[in-house]
Amino acid sequence: VVGGCVAHPHSWPWQVSLRTRFGMHFCGGTLISPEWVLTAAHCLEKSPRPSSYKVILGAHQEVNLEPHVQEIEVSRLFLEPTRKDIALLKLSSPAVITDKVIPACLPSPNYVVADRTECFITGWGETQGTFGAGLLKEAQLPVIENKVCNRYEFLNGRVQSTELCAGHLAGGTDSCQGDSGGPLVCFEKDKYILQGVTSWGLGCARPNKPGVYVRVSRFVTWIEGVMRNN
């Protein structure tokens, strides 16, 4: 995360670190049930074998993992069938739900986050020299409606209806490499709802170039179907 700040430890208990089997963090993810993690499909391009991946739950530091951290192998990988940048990992054993490891809530199917809704991104990704490398960072960003985001001076028609934009048009705060697959959550009524999966951007934190996130509400039916049938 570029800009933003270091998260209060364990304040985002659904945050997952997706790692190689050798323990190197390369993407984020979101725990959505004890056995399932949602991430970006492009995070799974490294290998078709579930054995190539493992997930870390309940962490704050990227490297020096605390004793309570849960490290779980992956048993299955599911790609969204219409080529969208979203995927599911089934864990080889269920996560133990604690005060530091809690699944995120999914949105209602096809729910549309209102323009300018303030949401949060989190991750251990590239900080581009801003403070907090190696620690879980967070940043608050407003959602930008697709019609605005697709204007010529912004993302110029690149954003699909199955995606959403979030960011400050002045730049300076954004998700970046290593945050991919992680959550964008928005507070609604009394809880945070997972509305986005960190997907892509034109650089990181550039003026007029907001980050792009997969719109989770468009895939709730697929997510629930995969979880139910597997």
Epitope: L44, E45, P48, R49, P50, S51, E73, S75, R76, L77, F78, L79, E80, P81, R83, S92, N230
Partner: antibody, heavy 120, light 106 residues
Framework: EVKLLESGGGLVQPGGSLKLSCAAS????????MSWVRQAPGKGLEWIGE????????NYTPSLKDKFIISRDNAKNSLYLQMSKVRSEDTALYYC?????????????WGQGTSVTVSS | DIQMTQSPSSLSASLGGKVSITCKAS??????ISWYQHKPGKGPRLLIH???TLQPGIPSRFSGSGSGRDYSFSISNLEPEDIATYYC????????FGGGTKLEIK
Amino acid sequence: EVKLLESGGGLVQPGGSLKLSCAASGFDFSRYWMSWVRQAPGKGLEWIGEINPDSSTINYTPSLKDKFIISRDNAKNSLYLQMSKVRSEDTALYYCASYCGYSYDALDCWGQGTSVTVSS
Amino acid sequence: DIQMTQSPSSLSASLGGKVSITCKASQDINKYISWYQHKPGKGPRLLIHYTSTLQPGIPSRFSGSGSGRDYSFSISNLEPEDIATYYCLQYDNLYTFGGGTKLEIK
């Protein structure tokens, strides 16, 4: 319906070359890793190698690394196996295989194979 | 590379009976093993993955178990259409097939 159709097999002389093809249909070929597997007469299945969607990573079984070249053309939904310096032990039925169930588990989608005979 | 030793290489059983096949890996494969049924003139058919998870549409007569280096596969209530060669496949690191087990009905 997912289909994998191998072609290009036939009779080839020892020391010769042959290029096998696998035409894919019914799934998003350009998104998936693809593998080649062979079965020599009276023997078991042997994995040859695999290629990732954009051809940037190709893995081979160690013993066949310098003998075979796997490639693909996503625009043509086709997978290829270039065989060189073939010997009699390369006589086999050659299968292409993939992950057609939108999950990466084990190889769950197979063609019916194309037969290669190495003989003078 | 990982070697898979499958046994027996052939077996014969009666209709309605039960058979078991084992595969031993040369190292821990962390349950990343699948089982295939292969009939002449067809491509192999995936039955089980991740040690014990049945593929959709595969009858519960087929089952798998194991951990570490040792894995087994069973078919109960044998039916005529089960005549085939069965293979294990490890996918922990690249892929390696076991040598196969040819099943015949007495």
